[in-house]
């Protein structure tokens, strides 16, 4: 399934390539990337009714058209559900050992820069992606993944670490962002919202998606994460938005079906190996890329973010399971575990495809506002 564009329908790309139509120019957030109504209970603010999108922010509802079994970022989803009237007591602080440096949480104290000064850096993540302002970089080739189809044995550790659910990945999962840009996958984790409240970390034109998966990689130039932290390109994260669809996602079900076992913070279980690439969109050729940071303390910068243009479809029940099963500290549900979008501060998001070119009948001249910085790579 894929949703039509927020503007008016326009034809798909030529031939059988199944190419997608980019987002329109209307309703772009402000240049400054300042927090919008959809911004989360990140380190700055607690969740509240003001975090909900206003009616004027809601895209109009369009019927679905037949195509591939996942959405595209250009085709923004329909309406956001109304907010949860009851505020989740998200990540209430369990102060077992005083205000230790590592005791950060989503929303409220301590401010993240006090936990780690890097959290006040100029090039932080997540960010709001505005396809119209993305620089089309033909040099950005399709991502290459090798060894991501894991056998059932050895089993993998799935853990509720109090901030997210994390799957530890074994050695041998290789990923290349391009020639000479090689990485090894270390772990994956998810970010989500609460009932009726989306919880992706990145946003697209201010729109927040239900959830987001992050697959974290270490550059092969480094032997350990410590060495790579803060170094440009030392870490790379593949990110994809999770969206509601009509069918159960069998790949995700292998993980979601085990969440009850790790409902308690700090608990873990073993799950059979699975095809990790099946948790990601199928189109590895169309993505956005920028340099940012870890989205949790210590917020180290230099992280290469690759955000897929295509989204992954989960059923409504699966999204509910994700957001309503795990518990965090202080006997509170683990929900709304996403950071507020951060200012770009002059960064240009690159796109592997002409995301800013509007092919709809309304656009007389294609517009590309930024040029590719990586053309010579």
């Amino acid at each position: 399934q894929r949703l039509p564009r927020m503007q008016e329908d326009s034809p798909l790309g030529g031939g059988s390539s199944g190419e997608d139509d980019p987002l329109g120019e209307e309703d772009l957030p402000s240049e400054e990337d300042s927090p919008r109504e959809e911004d989360p209970p990140g380190e700055e603010d607690l969740p509240g009714e003001e975090d909900l999108p206003g009616e004027e922010d809601l895209p109009e509802v369009k019927p679905k058209s037949e195509e591939e079994g996942s959405l595209k970022l250009e085709d923004l989803p329909t309406v956001e559900a109304p907010g949860d009237p009851q505020e989740p007591q998200n990540n209430a602080h369990r102060d077992k050992e005083g205000d230790d440096q590592s005791h950060w949480r989503y929303g409220g104290d301590p401010p993240w820069p006090r936990v780690s000064p890097a959290c006040a850096g100029r090039f932080q993540s997540p960010v709001d992606i505005r396809p119209q302002l993305a620089a089309f970089c033909p040099a950005l080739r399709p991502l290459e993944l090798l060894g991501f189809q894991l056998p059932p044995l050895p089993e993998l550790r799935l853990r509720n670490n109090g901030h997210s659910v994390q799957l530890t990945l074994p050695p041998g999962l290789e990923m290349a962002l391009g020639p000479g840009r090689e990485y090894r996958a270390l772990q994956l984790h998810l970010h989500w919202g609460a009932a009726g409240r989306p919880g992706s970390e990145h946003t697209v034109e201010g729109h927040r998606f239900p959830a987001e998966i992050h697959v974290v990689h270490l550059s092969t130039a480094f032997a350990r994460v410590d060495e790579a932290l803060g170094r440009p390109g030392g870490l790379a994260v593949l990110a994809a938005f999770l969206e509601e669809g009509p069918e159960e996602n069998s790949a995700y079900e292998q993980l979601l079906s085990r969440l009850e076992e790790i409902a308690e913070e700090g608990s873990e279980t073993q799950v059979p190996g699975l095809d990790i690439s099946a948790l990601l969109p199928s189109d590895f050729s169309r993505y956005f890329q920028y340099e940012g940071s870890l989205t949790t303390p210590p917020c180290a910068q230099g992280v290469i973010w690759t955000v897929f243009n295509q989204t992954v479809m989960l059923s409504a029940k699966q999204l509910h399971t994700l957001s309503d099963t795990l518990w965090g500290p202080g006997d509170s549900r683990l929900q709304l575990n996403f950071r507020a979008t951060q200012p770009l501060n002059g960064r240009v998001i690159e796109a592997s495809f002409p995301a800013g070119v509007d092919s709809s009948p309304r656009a007389a001249e294609p517009v590309q506002l930024n040029s590719c910085l990586a053309a010579g790579d």
Partner: nanobody, 114 residues
Framework: QVQLQESGGGLVQPGGSLRLSCTAS????????LGWYRQAPGNQRELVAT???????NYADSVKGRFTISRDNAAKTVSLQMNSLKPEDTAVYYC????????WGQGTQVTVSS
């Protein structure tokens, strides 16, 4: 790799106590979930206890009430106090540090025998 150095293993009589320690050489120690796992001959490695960055602890049912895990972020050390030891606690005990990466120590032998 992140260096995890275990110590404190040895031979102890049933009902006795041991304290295992693990020191990590990592600048991101505070953000790690730390754990102890064990592997007896012919068995798979199994969870003993973990402690998150927020000092939330989790224990295997078989050691609850007998073992206590703790961490000292300043010293970059995670410890496992093992009381009322039983012969079935005999195994190689491994220290684990997990955050972005997943790192293991070399293991220390614990033998409970009379």
């Amino acid at each position: 790799q992140v260096q995890l150095q275990e110590s404190g293993g040895g031979l102890v009589q049933p009902g006795g106590s041991l304290r295992l320690s693990c020191t990590a050489s990592t600048s991101s120690f505070n953000f790690q979930t730390l754990g102890w796992y064990r592997q007896a001959p012919g068995n798979q490695r199994e969870l003993v206890a973990t402690i998150t960055s927020r000092a939330i602890t989790n224990y295997a049912d078989s050691v609850k009430g007998r073992f206590t895990i703790s961490r000292d972020n300043a010293a970059k050390t995670v410890s496992l106090q093992m009381n009322s030891l039983k012969p079935e606690d005999t195994a190689v005990y491994y220290c684990n540090a997990a955050w972005i990466g997943d790192y293991w120590g070399q293991g220390t032998q614990v033998t409970v025998s009379s």
